[in-house]
């Protein structure tokens, strides 16, 4: 996972409906000058990406870890 | 009846704030972001920035970002656009528009806005 | 800051005859391109999204086609109802900029 940024908010909808073991990828995207809040996409195993509230509890934690330290690109 | 239906005109002193309603109806508000765009007269047109509907969280250009808030009421499906520190540059025709609809699958081919209000005159003057 | 430039400033024609309005972006906006008509004292209407998709309730012949930074609307036969103003808009990034705007005018 990396701190990443997008050029406008990707995300105007959120789900929390996913298993953790669906996951293959997430995509932290950064509060930023394009887009005032935190996203987070994930890339499932099936192929498809979706949009995940960063305030899920099994995703904060995780959060948290990439953005205070994670591999950061811009 | 798919619409979005502003507040009416508003005469303000410079200085002074004007809030700006639009009423979103007959259709899915989380599913679109609204946008704000002003037009002075005989101008073009100008993106104030837009708010999430669902999280209510804004954007905003830069060149209004100390001036404008922008603020939604989902229990009336309500957006609302105040600027302060108004002086004569800012009059203008204030619109709302909507832009969507996107679902929580995350889009890079975005839509073009489809719905607009009918828009609100601010006059600033002393 | 994204900026997009429109040409021609005013475009003098007949009814009946094709026009053909220019719309380039300062650097990529992929087909993030949009065309909205407005006509005096009206709000700006979406004609084309996406560069070329159409939208429900516009006449055909109205389209739109383009990438990267140059993109074109074309109004393949002119009627009475199109003499306005023309301006493209991008979303690809935030923020949200519009042309200067093309005045459709009889000639």
């Known amino acids: 996972a990396a701190v990443l940024r997008e050029l406008r908010c990707v995300c105007l909808q959120t789900t929390q409906g996913v298993h953790p073991k669906m996951i293959s990828n997430l995509q932290v995207f950064a509060i930023g000058p394009q887009c005032s809040k935190v996203e987070v996409v994930a890339s499932l195993k099936n192929g498809k990406e979706i949009c995940l509230d960063p305030e899920a509890p099994f995703l904060k934690k995780v959060i948290q870890k990439i953005l205070d330290g994670g591999n950061k690109e811009n | 009846q798919v619409q979005l239906v502003q507040s009416g005109a508003e005469v303000k002193k410079p200085g002074a704030s004007v809030k700006v309603s639009c009423k979103a109806s007959?259709?899915?508000?989380?599913?679109?972001?609204i946008h704000w765009v002003r037009q002075a007269p005989g101008q073009g047109l100008e993106w104030m920035g837009n708010?999430?509907?669902?999280?209510?969280?804004?954007n905003y250009n830069e060149k209004f970002k100390s001036r404008v808030t922008m603020t939604r009421d989902t229990s009336t499906s309500t957006v609302y656009m105040e600027l302060s520190s108004l002086r004569s540059e800012d009059t203008a025709v204030y619109y709302c528009?909507?832009?969507?609809?996107?679902?929580?699958?995350?889009?890079?081919?975005?839509?073009?806005?489809?719905?607009w209000g009918q828009g609100t005159l601010v006059t600033v003057s002393s | 800051e994204i900026v997009l430039t429109q040409s021609p400033a005013t475009l003098s024609l007949s009814p009946g005859e094709r026009a053909t309005l220019s719309c380039r972006a300062s650097?990529?906006?992929?087909?993030?391109l949009h065309w909205y008509q407005q006509k005096p004292g009206q709000a700006p209407r979406l004609l084309i999204y996406?560069?070329?998709r159409s939208v429900s309730g516009i006449p055909a012949r109205f389209s739109g086609s383009g990438s990267g930074t140059d993109f074109t609307l074309t109004i393949s036969s002119l009627e009475p109802e199109d003499f306005a103003v023309y301006y493209c808009?991008?979303?690809?990034?935030?923020?949200?900029?519009f042309g200067g705007g093309t005045k459709v005018e009889i000639k």
């Open positions: 528009a909507r832009e969507g609809p996107y679902s929580y699958y995350p889009s890079r081919q975005y839509y073009g806005s489809d719905l």
């Open positions: 007959g259709y899915e508000f989380t599913s679109y972001w």
């Open positions: 708010i999430s509907p669902n999280s209510g969280s804004a």
């Open positions: 650097q990529s906006i992929s087909n993030n």
């Open positions: 996406y560069t070329s």
């Open positions: 808009g991008q979303n690809n990034e935030w923020p949200e900029v």
